[in-house]
Amino acid sequence: QSGPLPKPSLQALPSSLVPLEKPVTLRCQGPPGVDLYRLEKLSSSRYQDQAVLFIPAMKRSLAGRYRCSYQNGSLWSLPSDQLELVATGVFAKPSLSAQPGPAVSSGGDVTLQCQTRYGFDQFALYKEGDPAPYKNPERWYRASFPIITVTAAHSGTYRCYSFSSRDPYLWSAPSDPLELVVTGT
């Protein structure tokens, strides 16, 4: 029954990182003319028959993985890519520092370190303007984020979050921003 219908897109506006009590809208977008959508929250057995889910105030219980599909005739589309909706501000903010310092020469190395007083085992580093976290292959969840051979593209404002692998969609508040300055470019 699941045929060649292309998968829809699912996005969170303004962002999939949502501070507690702040609004967010999940929007499922399929081809023109489609009006039968199903938006599911995974690992909760629940779904709604609308393309748009407006959350006026983010709650912990709404954090998690979402997916959507649409129906055309009797055929279901392929499912959208999963969207991970994260509630932030659940825990106190970590601190973010740069070693050896926030000013680094082009071509040099710098390590951004995220530290927290709590026993969290997961950390995510975001650069302002980038939608996805800064990931080191297989190791993005570590507290240290080494940046090797810095270029001008690495300059900007960074923030980090801490969370637990037991509750991967409940994150801390963001750290205070750290401005990374690349000199000699």
Epitope: R38, S43, S45, Y47, D49, S74
Partner: antibody
Framework: QVQLVESGGGLVKPGGSLRLSCAAS????????MSWIRQAPGKGLEWVSS????????DYAASVKGRFTISRDNAKNSLYLQMNSLRAEDTAVYYC????????????????WGQGTLVTVSS | QSVLTQPPSVSGAPGQRVTISCTGS?????????VHWYQQLPGTAPKLLIY???NRPSGVPDRFSGSKSGTSASLAITGLQAEDEADYYC???????????FGGGTKLTVLG
């Protein structure tokens, strides 16, 4: 309290037709997805078809697609299953079941079932 | 053949603990869908026993518990009683065509 009462079962010849009804009471029928689930004698449960709360989303098991038609009348608090081109393997007790709902969310499980109506397809 | 696989039968003496397994695939249980369990006493309609992998509706004794891991789930019954003798079915949802799927059912016999 929630009540689901099926009717319309009986003996029918292969190739024949039958229309099952499910009368719902004790809850806001138009808010809930509804399904038909069947159980052949001595066998397990088999989901047959479901319909969305507004009658828009409709799904069928592959075994009945093209032969059975699910519908609902929210004004009458009733669910229906029109069964055409019946086969011996359609012989079963047919249950009407309600899907759980909470606030804006529907759920993928059945919280209330009727007592069932027996459909026998035999020459 | 059922989409979800259950053992046809299990048995135990009164007071014992029994478990019933339910194995699915990456398109149903493994796709993020929960598992639900129903109890069908002889001659009656099925009744919801466990929803959302491990939650009990009001009125269901805490002797019944459920869990899920990966592409499978299990139902545990402790302190087995004669009135637990029934058929038990697991149920989930399948992403392929958005259909509801059941296990083949497990007949629980209370010995003695």
């Amino acid at each position: 309290q929630v009540q689901l009462v099926e009717s319309g079962g009986g003996l029918v010849k292969p190739g024949g037709s039958l229309r099952l009804s499910c009368a719902a009471s004790g809850f806001s029928f138009s808010d809930h997805y509804m399904s038909w689930i069947r159980q052949a004698p001595g066998k397990g449960l088999e989901w047959v078809s479901s319909v969305g709360s507004e009658g828009k989303f409709i799904d069928y098991a592959a075994s009945v697609k093209g032969r059975f038609t699910i519908s609902r009348d929210n004004a009458k608090n009733s669910l229906y299953l029109q069964m055409n081109s019946l086969r011996a393997e359609d012989t079963a007790v047919y249950y009407c079941a309600r899907h759980y709902r909470e606030f804006r969310w529907h759920y993928y499980y059945f919280d209330y079932w009727g007592q069932g109506t027996l459909v026998t397809v035999s020459s | 053949q059922s989409v979800l696989t259950q053992p046809p039968s299990v048995s135990g003496a009164p007071g014992q603990r029994v478990t019933i397994s339910c194995t699915g695939s990456s398109s149903n249980i493994g796709a993020g869908y929960d598992v639900h369990w129903y109890q069908q006493l002889p001659g009656t309609a099925p009744k919801l026993l466990i929803y959302g992998n491990s939650n009990r509706p009001s009125g269901v004794p805490d002797r019944f518990s459920g869990s899920k891991s990966g592409t499978s789930a299990s139902l545990a019954i402790t302190g087995l009683q004669a009135e637990d003798e029934a058929d038990y079915y697991c149920q989930s949802h399948d992403l392929g065509a958005h259909v509801w799927v059941f296990g083949g059912g497990t007949k629980l016999t209370v010995l003695g």
